[in-house]
Interface confidence: low
């Protein structure tokens, strides 16, 4: 703020992202025929009026008038952080300080610890790490659109003594719905200005099969051809399908992949049919009641999980 001393220069603190450009602006109301000067934290003069004093091509003159001296520093490095001084050589010399804070941009996070082919109900533990942030960034986890609660972000100083490496772990019990899900670790930091910087890990979950019997056509009549499709789901996908008819000698022959075919439907085909879908994760038997006397088959609500 402008003080009562019209010859007192003023400036402002600035925050810049590493690699970015910062503009340092110094103003004075009454210059008393003196020039303004900018110097760096090492007390090296950068500009005296419109005259360049330091050979650094990153530092450029923006504006030089009797009442203002503005310079820009491009490709700012962490080492550029500190107090910059604007001076006016009146009697006495008056100065104003600008604290330049350089933000370290966090690197893209790295996810480690994923063990392939997790089984349903097992616990997945993933670790996430990001280096280079200043101040220390925060890490968050999500699974799809759902937030995951990881442990508190751990902070470790990088070897340069200026930036930080942050890390976080998350553990959760996987379900079959998680098969193919993306676990995302995002880094949150003011240098990113809301931009997303994240890494995702797609997980595979092995789970026991399920099956469903689907008739084709949906409403077969006596004399028609009928296909009973056994549609297996699971990871891995069931590779073996066995058909049985209650009261008959098992198993029945399949004639088309996992389907049971009736070339010419008759009343003796009535009964309850079971299809057992098997993978190396287990088996599941679905049942279907076929009543040829009726105009359409009635699916049974019962199914058995082995």
């Amino acid at each position: 703020n402008l003080s009562q001393d019209d010859s007192q220069p003023w400036t402002s603190d600035e925050t810049v992202v590493a690699g970015g450009t910062v503009v340092l602006k110094c103003q004075v109301k009454d210059h008393e025929d003196s020039s303004l000067q900018w110097s760096n934290p090492a007390q090296q003069t950068l500009y005296f009026g419109e005259k360049r004093a330091l050979r650094d091509n990153r530092i450029q003159l923006v504006s030089s008038t009797p009442h203002e001296l503005s310079i820009s520093i491009s490709n700012v490095a962490l080492a550029d952080e500190g107090e910059y001084t604007c001076s006016i050589f009146t009697m006495p010399v008056r100065t104003a300080k600008s604290l330049v804070t350089v933000l370290g941009i966090p690197q893209k996070p790295i996810i480690t610890g994923y063990k392939s082919s997790l089984r349903e109900k097992e616990t997945a533990t993933l670790n996430c790490q990001s280096s280079g942030s200043k101040p220390a960034a925060q890490l968050t986890w999500r699974k799809g659109d759902q937030e995951l609660h990881g442990d508190q972000t751990r902070i470790q100083e990088d070897p340069n003594g200026k930036t930080f490496t942050v890390s976080s772990s998350v553990s959760f019990q996987v379900t079959r719905e998680d098969d193919g899900a993306n676990i995302v670790c995002s880094v949150n930091h003011e240098s990113l200005k809301g931009a997303d910087r994240s890494t995702s890990q797609r997980i595979e979950v092995l789970y026991t099969p399920t099956a469903m019997i689907r008739p084709e056509p949906a409403h077969p009549r006596e004399g028609q051809k009928l296909l009973l499709h056994c549609e297996g789901r699971g990871n891995p996908v069931p590779q073996q399908y066995v058909w049985v008819k209650e009261g008959s000698e098992p198993p029945l022959k399949m004639t088309q992949e996992s389907a049971l075919i009736f070339p010419f439907l008759n009343k003796s085909d009535s009964g309850t049919y079971g299809c057992t879908a098997t993978s190396n994760m287990g088996s599941y038997t679905a049942y279907f009641t076929l009543n040829v006397n009726d105009p359409s088959p009635v699916p049974s609500s019962s199914s058995t999980y082995h």
Partner: nanobody
């Protein structure tokens, strides 16, 4: 050293029941599947039942369905085979087996560690 120790076998009358136990030592088996197999004199070893690491998935041979139940107690590192309505055809040496991976398997090739077996005799 991995060890699987079966117990609970014996002589039982037809229609009777037995409960076999398989205790594991030398390694934590709670995260792994376990299986029961049997071998009758002069016959090949055959699959009886298997259970996954959590107990959520089980599988049975046709000869065991409805009569035998496999279960596990991970706190005790033990798997059980409850055998009801026993028949003379169930007479065999019963073996407990564990795979070296978490993947369950329903045939003998999928198992790496075997117990010494326990004799089950069903006779009147």
């Amino acid at each position: 050293q991995v060890q699987l120790v079966e117990s609970g076998g014996g002589l039982v009358q037809p229609g009777g029941s037995l409960r076999l136990s398989c205790a594991a030592s030398g390694r934590t088996f709670s995260n792994y599947a376990r299986g029961w197999f049997r071998q009758a004199p002069g016959k090949e070893r055959e699959f009886v039942a298997a259970i996954d690491y959590s107990g959520g998935s089980t599988n049975y041979a046709d000869s065991a369905k409805g009569r035998f139940t496999i279960s596990r107690d991970n706190a005790k590192n033990t798997v059980y085979l409850q055998m009801n309505s026993l028949k003379p055809g169930d007479t065999a040496v019963y073996y407990c087996a564990a795979p070296a991976s978490r993947r369950p398997s329903w045939d003998a090739d999928g198992y790496d560690y075997w117990g010494q077996g326990t004799q089950v005799t069903v006779s009147s």
